[in-house]
């Protein structure tokens, strides 16, 4: 059962796993959610009735029954982890805590103009978990405007104390705001010989890399495969760090793989979601339950639905035994990973999918692309919406993309002459315009947010957000697309598609069925040559064939230029403008979304 509200002046008795320090009960709840075993927590707020050494303590708790006895205690705030909830969760915390000093290892001290600059410094420093900034009003003259970058083993402060005229906050790496290099390579036959901060068992290097990414201290990893000569080290995932943040020594060793934390590539890759099945593989751990199940997929579902289950092993039924049902072993451990991995015993193992909601919804798999043809099929582009105006009569106005459960990203030029959001309707999960009838459900628009530097499409800033009146429930036919991550600025996208119900030639009409076209990206330099009379800025991106023939056109505006990279779809562009449609040597010009990620996050995450 999902309980989101916090219980004031209430303490949960017993079940303690560990104690951490957090600046608020809200953040304590997030820490509990991300902890592999925590189901409940008790936070102690600052209070004159409470011993100051206990202020800001966040006690993480577990219980077989998923609840614990409640006791009244002033200044205690208790609650439940979001593991029990189906909504999406994020570790991103932009809050700034005034008059709080979050203690950790102070490894870097420098002068900064503001707390925001200090936070940016922390976000762009590979080791930084959180910071404390002494403001201009700080009593000690030589400490004023000093920005202290800090880290700890757990990623949370070792203590929090009251201190006048300082502010503290966390790194925004988990908000996808880091400019640190994103290094995606996995190096075969490589061991990184730096200090290990932790080790876990993993079935493959990809799971090992994802564990490294969400481990607060891990910067790179080495994984020993099941063919590794030393039996005791097989499937061992070594989580590593170094002072420089980079591996100091690389040793060539067969059957080992090494790679990097993807913390600066966040939001465009699944980090928590290990969705693969591992055949002829048994995961060992503490047994939670043994249940009969028809298949390994059914076993994974059972594990996902059992809040304490972290991973499972399924043993298929022996012929005609137990109505063809096999045994599903639901398991857990202290760190969420198997305690041992065995091969050759016939089991099929995997992980709970409960943690997938901690990844951006946009990273989950969608229907495979239909190759050839120009008409899309249902569910092929689940982020694509059709934006209708009802004035003077109802018609398709523009395309748009779902980027959050209350947010559509589209083009600013769509709203020329639109006086009020009241006349707009957003339809999602639509393949054919003819499906839209009087009684078809739609999302009303609460607010239109147009970039304040927008003047006209050709001069850039052609971007707008629509805040919906109600939230979108994600399904196979309506779900978000990932924004490109700033850490991925240098990805060269080769699989890009433009979609929309727009004209198929310059003088035409809106199409009934959603159309798609695969279109190559064009360098800005090449694009500039084709548009001598315009300035093609870095905030624009171009796509098109030199010979023309495929392009976006009238009515596609605001829709997505979607590019697939590492099995994840990214919203690389927003259909903006072009000279004619599909003309030779006249590529389409799109808003370059990666350049507006900060703007999008600022507008969508504003309180």
């Amino acid at each position: 059962e999902c309980v989101t509200q916090l219980l004031k002046d209430t303490c949960f008795e017993g079940g303690d796993i560990t104690t951490v320090f957090t600046p608020s009960a809200k953040y304590c709840q997030v820490v509990c959610t991300y902890h592999p075993r925590c189901l409940l927590f008790t936070f102690t707020a600052e209070s004159p009735s409470e011993d100051p050494t206990r202020w800001f303590t966040c006690v993480l708790k577990d219980s077989v029954t998923e609840t614990l006895p409640r006791v009244n205690r002033t200044a205690a705030i208790s609650g439940y982890s979001f593991k029990q909830c189906s909504h999406q969760i994020s570790a991103c915390n932009k809050d700034i805590y005034v008059d709080l000093d979050m203690k950790g290892i102070n490894y870097n001290s420098s002068v900064a103009k503001s707390a925001q600059e200090c936070q940016e410094r922390c976000t762009d420093d590979v080791h930084c978990h959180f910071f404390t900034y002494a403001t201009r009003q700080f009593p000690s003259l030589e400490h004023r405007n000093i920005c202290l970058l800090k880290h700890t083993q757990t990623g949370t402060p070792t203590r929090i104390t009251k201190l006048d005229k300082v502010v503290s906050g966390f790194s925004l790496k988990s908000c996808a705001l880091s400019n640190l290099a994103c290094i995606r390579d996995i190096f075969p036959n490589t061991v990184f010989a730096d200090s290990n901060i932790d080790s876990v068992m993993a079935p493959d290097a990809f799971v090992c890399g994802r564990i490294c990414t969400h481990h607060p201290g891990c910067l790179f990893f080495t994984f020993f495969s099941q063919e590794w000569p030393k039996e005791s080290q097989r499937n061992l995932c070594l989580l590593k760090t170094s002072e420089s943040g980079l591996p100091s020594t690389r040793i060539k060793k067969s059957k080992a793989l090494s790679g990097f934390s993807l913390q600066s590539c966040r939001h465009s890759i699944p980090v928590f979601c290990h969705s693969s099945f591992y055949h002829d593989t048994d995961f060992l751990g503490e047994e939670l339950d043994i249940v009969a199940a028809k298949s390994h997929e059914a076993c994974q579902k059972l594990c996902t639905n059992a809040v304490r289950c972290q991973f499972f092993t399924y043993t298929p039924a022996q012929a005609s035994c137990n109505e063809g049902k096999g045994k599903c072993y639901l398991k857990l451990s202290s760190n969420g990973s198997p305690t041992k991995i065995l091969h050759g015993r016939g089991g099929i193992s995997g992980y709970t999918l409960r943690l997938c909601k901690m990844d951006n919804e946009c990273t989950t798999k969608i229907k495979p692309r239909i190759v050839g043809g120009t008409a899309s099929v249902r569910g092929e582009w689940p982020w694509q919406v059709t934006l209708h105006t009802t004035s003077p009569t109802q018609r398709h106005l523009c395309g748009g993309s779902i980027i959050g459960n209350q947010w559509i990203l589209t083009a600013a030029h769509c709203f020329y002459g639109v006086e009020s959001p009241k006349i707009l309707r957003v339809y999602s999960g639509i393949l054919n315009q003819s499906e839209i009838k009087e009684d078809t459900s739609f999302f009303g628009v609460q607010e239109i947010i147009i970039h304040d530097q927008y003047k006209m499409a050709e001069s850039g800033y052609d971007i707008a957000l629509l805040k919906l009146e109600t939230t979108v429930n994600y399904t196979d036919s309506q779900r978000p697309i990932c924004l490109p991550s700033k850490g991925d600025r240098n990805v060269i996208y080769t699989d890009c598609w433009v979609t929309g119900w727009g004209y198929r030639k310059l003088r035409d009409k809106i199409q009934n069925t959603l159309q798609k076209a695969k279109i190559p990206l064009v360098t800005n330099e090449e694009c500039q040559k084709r548009y001598r009379g315009h300035k093609i800025t870095h905030k624009m991106i171009c796509a098109g064939y030199r010979e023309g023939g495929k392009d976006a056109c009238k009515g596609d505006s605001g829709g997505p230029l979607s590019c697939k990279h590492n099995e994840v779809w990214h919203l690389v562009g927003i259909t903006s403008w072009g000279e004619g449609c599909a003309q030779r040597e006249r590529p389409g010009v799109y808003t370059n979304v990666v350049e507006y990620v900060d703007w999008i996050l600022e507008k969508t995450q504003a309180v």
Epitope: D124, V126, S178, N179, L180, A181, I183, R184, D185, F187, L219, S244, G245, L246, P247, S248, T249, R250, N490
Partner: nanobody, 124 residues
């Protein structure tokens, strides 16, 4: 003593090409970030291209994408910047820099070691 030495600069017509080299002594490019930066008169130093030498991951400023290519020769401990389709606005002193930490690849403030620079002049 760490030394980075740039070479290959000079004058070229718009549309032409140049190849800059950066040779290091006392510092190994392997396992580190190496960047090319430039500074035009009266302007701030800006990142042009960077490479993480271990895997060869490359990073480029939008203004040079598709025109400039950064590459490395680990055996010679040298990094190159191939510059094609040069424009007048590419005129600047080009610096090679080495980082000793994981960095935002095009942020000059985070690089530790710097060369003396080589002048590139593009005339239109």
């Amino acid at each position: 003593q760490v030394q980075l030495v740039e070479s290959g600069g000079g004058s070229v017509q718009a549309g032409g090409s140049l190849r800059l080299s950066c040779a290091a002594s006392g510092y190994t490019f392997n396992n580190n970030f190496v960047g090319w930066f430039r500074q035009a008169p009266g302007k701030e130093r800006e990142g042009v291209a960077a490479i993480y030498s271990l895997g060869g991951s490359t990073y480029y400023a939008d203004s040079v994408k598709g025109r400039f290519t950064i590459s490395q020769d680990n055996s010679k401990n040298t990094v190159y910047l191939q510059m094609n389709s040069l424009r007048a606005e590419d005129t600047a002193v080009y610096y090679c820099a080495g980082a000793i930490t994981w960095v935002p690849p095009l942020s000059h403030r985070r690089y530790t070691y710097w060369g003396q620079g080589t002048l590139v002049t593009v005339s239109s």
